[in-house]
Interface confidence: low
């Protein structure tokens, strides 16, 4: 018998209720291998998720997220809030940056300026919420009282990313 | 596809520090927070505390800010975590897991196996 | 630390029956709520998030509820597979604390 079954192709199931007969899988489902007992149900995109990829009968639904959300985790398994260049999200929704941070992209936590000094560099343009700051020739090879940023890096609140 | 690697076992004499390993694969290393999370036989879970590889932010578990020391090697997406004068208090089964970069509605979305430590002379 | 009081400690119960396990934070924790389940010798499994969230794959006899400190997490008709150990984690705050577990056995 379980040689019967291993005959099924993907997109079928071997059915116990007809003597090991190699069924198609019913609508909204599919199995991905041959040799199945069952057919999985189709992942569905529904709410903040779009489809990417319809399901068939040998692969599931691929979702993705609707516009001002981002994909997160395994098989874009959840969706997150999308903020502006030079905020990031906080359980209270999108904040701005803190003084000394950025972050340049629609996702993700803000981060320090980069430290100049530590490479014997100076500030050539100045960091906002939104960029980095630019690095230029060392304070040495410029005029006296040339000086470059060096914010410490902020504290992340208690609830950054705790897990 | 995804994985976290940990060794299935570890021996450690009393007072000598050990370093368990987390190898990850199939994924930027960089993006995720790696956690480590402790259960003694038999018993519950516990966080220890997590690390961003990016920037090898750190987080902690104030139980445990003497006893563990975490650390990345970018170059070989591997997670540490160094565990100090173990004693038999710390033989238990430590696994390490990922989150998402930033994410409130948050989950651990892969394990790795665990890796079972064992504080014996 | 935020406390996580969960119950029962073990319990058992019939296929097909609904079950329900609680959870009770030492303050409020704004639904900042993942329920866990775990096999012998195996990681853990998150099964909810955000208190009421189905992870994508996950069964929908799972289903979580509540909000403020009381929290619970229901299987509405038990399967064979369910049995194993539950456990809740508070992540509202660091350090992320979990329930101390709920093992679900098969009468």
């Known amino acids: 018998l379980q040689d019967l079954c291993s005959n099924c192709p993907a997109g079928t199931f071997c059915d116990n209720n007809r003597s090991q007969i190699c069924s198609p899988c019913p609508p909204n489902s599919f199995s991905s291998a041959g040799g199945q007992r069952t057919c999985d149900i189709c992942r569905q995109c529904k709410g903040v998720f779009k489809t990417r990829k319809e399901c068939s009968s040998t692969s599931n639904a691929e979702c993705d997220c609707i516009s001002g959300y981002h994909c997160l985790g395994a098989e874009c398994s959840m969706c997150e809030q999308d903020c502006k260049q030079g905020q990031e999200l906080t359980k209270k929704g999108c904040k701005d940056c803190c003084f000394g941070t950025f972050n340049d992209q629609k996702r993700g936590i803000c981060r320090p300026w980069t430290n100049c000094s530590l490479d014997g560099k100076s500030v050539l343009v100045n960091g906002t919420k939104e960029r980095d700051v630019v690095c230029g020739p060392s304070p040495a090879d410029l005029s006296p009282g040339a000086s470059s940023a060096t914010p410490p890096a902020p504290a992340r609140e208690p609830g950054h990313s705790p897990q | 596809q995804v994985q976290l690697q940990q060794p299935g076992a570890e021996l450690v004499r009393p007072g000598a520090s050990v370093k368990l390993s987390c190898k990850a694969s199939g994924y930027t290393f960089s993006s995720y927070w790696i956690n480590w999370v402790k259960q003694r036989p038999g018993q519950g879970l516990e966080w220890i505390g997590n690390?961003?590889?990016?920037?090898?932010?750190?987080n902690y578990n104030q139980k445990f800010k003497d006893k563990a020391t975490l650390t990345v090697d970018k170059s070989s997406s591997t997670a540490y975590m160094q565990l100090s004068s173990p004693t038999s208090d710390d033989s238990a089964v430590y696994y390490c897991t990922r989150t998402w970069e930033f994410y409130y509605d948050s989950v651990f979305d892969y394990w790795g196996q665990g890796t079972t430590l064992t504080v014996s002379s | 630390d935020i406390k996580m009081t969960q119950s029962p400690s073990s319990m058992y119960a019939s296929l097909g029956e609904r079950v329900t396990i609680t959870c009770k934070a030492s303050q409020d924790i704004n639904s900042y709520l993942s329920w866990f389940q775990q096999k012998p010798g195996k990681s853990p499994k998150t099964l909810i998030y955000r208190a009421n969230r189905l992870v994508d794959g996950v069964p929908s006899r799972f289903s979580g509820s509540g909000s403020g400190q009381d929290y619970s997490l229901t299987i509405s008709s038990l399967e064979y597979e369910d049995m194993g150990i539950y456990y809740c984690?508070?992540?509202?705050?660091?350090?992320?604390?979990f329930g101390g577990g709920t093992k679900l056995e098969i009468k």
């Open positions: 690390i961003y590889p990016s920037d090898s932010y750190t």
């Open positions: 984690l508070q992540y509202d705050e660091l350090p992320p604390t």
